[in-house]
Amino acid sequence: TIPPHVQKSVNNDMIVTDNNGAVKFPQLCKFCDVRFSTCDNQKSCMSNCSITSICEKPQEVCVAVWRKNDENITLETVCHDPKLPYHDFILEDAASPKCIMKEKKKPGETFFMCSCSSDECNDNIIFSEEYNTSNPDLLLVIFQ
């Protein structure tokens, strides 16, 4: 719980508590923003990001965004609040311990995004289909 000597200031989103009043600690995430990547046609990739950050706010989770266009491939690693959209998409899988990439529709590029809530979980990004059984099209393929 928040000890009495730690003041909970007005509109303070740096102190996040659960229903029992226990103070939630911040996530530890890879945080290199956007970097060029060689990750392509693989089941999983490491981020090759050497920066692990303490997320600024305890409600933030780890996020990775993989993008491929005609010119290059980039991988973005950040902390982000799952209550807010990122790149115009909701972070549906924010509570997952693993960063399971899901494709999103973006014109002119291939765009995958994942989010997760365990230490440095956006360091290992997973494209492998065996993890993506929540995809209805994939379930059709599996059961045919």
């Epitope: 659960d18 226990a22 103070v23 939630k24 600690f25 530890l28 303490i54």
Partner: nanobody
């Protein structure tokens, strides 16, 4: 009973250094991830640094990276925060905290030690 007792705070000039200590007792210190947090007057709690239980991997907030160093001495059950190149904005009450076994919440805090950076 779990206890965390911070010490080492005080008044220091900008550019100066301080070393904070947190004496821990009542739990298996070397099995706990430990954190330093701070709270400036009228501001929210800011998570400053963490140190892992295994391998002593360290983590820092961007605001203190390159200036602060967290360390621990498991034989003395003590957590440290070496603060160099101190700035006025580092003025705050500094708390050490033990991460709970659930790995989801803080369950024990120290009473805090005040660091004032002023000329």
């Amino acid at each position: 009973e779990v206890q965390l007792l911070e010490s080492g705070g005080g008044l220091v000039q900008p550019g100066g250094s301080l070393r904070l200590s947190c004496a821990a007792s009542g739990f298996t210190f070397d099995a706990a991830r430990m954190w330093w947090a701070r709270q400036a007057p009228g501001k929210g709690l800011e998570w400053v640094s963490a140190i892992a239980d295994i391998g002593n991997t360290t983590y820092y907030a961007d605001s203190v990276k390159g200036r602060f160093t967290i360390s621990r001495d498991n034989s003395k059950n003590t957590l440290y925060l070496q603060m160099n190149s101190l700035r006025a904005e580092d003025t705050a009450v500094y708390y050490c905290a033990k991460q709970s076994g659930s790995e989801d919440h803080f369950d024990y805090w120290g009473q805090g030690t005040l660091v004032t950076v002023s000329s």
